[in-house]
Amino acid sequence: APVRSLHCTLRDAQLKSLVMSGPYELKALHLQGQDLEQQVVFSMSFVQGEESNDKIPVALGLKAKNLYLSCVLKDDKPTLQLESVDPKNYPKKKMEKRFVFNKIEINNKLEFESAQFPNWYISTSQAENMPVFLGGTRGGQDITDFTMQFVSS
């Protein structure tokens, strides 16, 4: 069976939107009005992995681009990157480990934990216009909570 996907946007707990910053980076900033059209639309695919009631494995691609968020070690540190893939082969049910995130729902908020690096989360800074990154702390200064807005295909 083909992998199930949906289109969505994400905003962090401070209501910052995610936009492209150069070809291989996302940044978070507050957008209003027509500027909201700049925000990236994700293609969230429901992939193979360990699943529970509040934890669902997903891959996060950028709609209409052959780019996926992935988590790799760079200089011995878990790092979030945008990785290009062959569009003929993605998305797929069995994604490589680095592409998989555990979507965790708590109190109507979403967290995205790296499946490859447990306890590391997609994060944004309090400051405006800063890169989206993989952070190793929850409940600190950096933001790990998001809300999801469905986008019609």
């Epitope: 193979q48 062959d86 082969n89 490589e96 480990k97 680095r98």
Partner: antibody
């Protein structure tokens, strides 16, 4: 010091089954990011990746095997298994287990290999 | 599947020579490439990972370079113990695939 030791190889007729074991020491397969893979080498040929298992139980297989092999682990025994069913002559090879950490993979430590011969 | 093609299949060289082995991928594999050395009857040994990072304990005469779909392993000055077969491995996409190998033999 990391060590991996394969066992369970031998001769079997086409259609038969074998279970290979990879006993390891010097690392734990409950450590996040850790993985063990099976790689085989037919006589005089190159290397072919067969299967892989991560610390969290996530498994991957080479689709060329068409579902005949199953990988599993016993974390408490520090052992990874490869159950091979419906064996064919083309499965004749040395089977190595090897350790990696994280994806993308590179295999840091290898066992010495165990030989599987499928012949009537 | 991603096909990995190594060239040459066999390479004859002498001690002290500088040699280069090439690995080509059938599509872009980023820098997700590793190199292994194997001697007859032995298990492979990791030399290089992430295209250019030298595995601990590997002599500095070994180096790796490349990106995208073309990669090279270079041995700057061949030593007697370097005569072996060399394999590349791509880790970009499952199934992970090896090159067919390059046998480095004494001229």
């Amino acid at each position: 010091e990391v060590q991996l030791v394969e066992s369970g190889g031998g001769s079997v007729q086409p259609g038969g089954s074998l279970r290979l074991s990879c006993a390891f020491s010097g690392f734990s397969l409950s450590t996040s990011g850790m993985g063990v893979g099976w790689i085989r080498q037919a006589p005089g040929k190159g290397l072919e990746w067969v299967s892989h298992i991560w610390w969290d139980g996530d498994e991957s297989y080479n689709p060329s095997l068409k579902g005949r092999f199953t990988i599993s682990k016993d974390t408490s025994r520090n052992t990874v298994y490869l159950q091979m069913n419906s064996l064919r002559a083309e499965d004749t090879a040395s089977y190595f287990c090897a350790r990696n950490r994280y994806d993308p993979p590179w295999f840091v430590d290898w066992g010495q290999g165990t030989t599987v011969t499928v012949s009537s | 599947d991603i096909q990995m093609t190594q060239s040459p299949s066999t390479l004859s060289a002498s001690v002290g020579d500088r040699v280069t082995i090439t690995c080509r991928a059938s599509q872009d594999i980023s820098n997700y490439l590793s190199w292994y050395q194997q001697k007859p009857g032995k298990a492979p040994k990791l030399l290089i990972y992430y295209t250019s990072k030298l595995h601990s304990g590997v002599p500095s005469r070994f180096s790796g370079s490349g990106s995208g779909a073309e990669f090279t392993l270079t041995i700057s000055s061949l030593q007697p113990e370097d005569f072996a077969t060399y394999f590349c491995l791509q880790g970009k996409m499952l199934p992970w695939t090896f090159g067919q190998g390059t046998k480095l033999e004494i001229k």
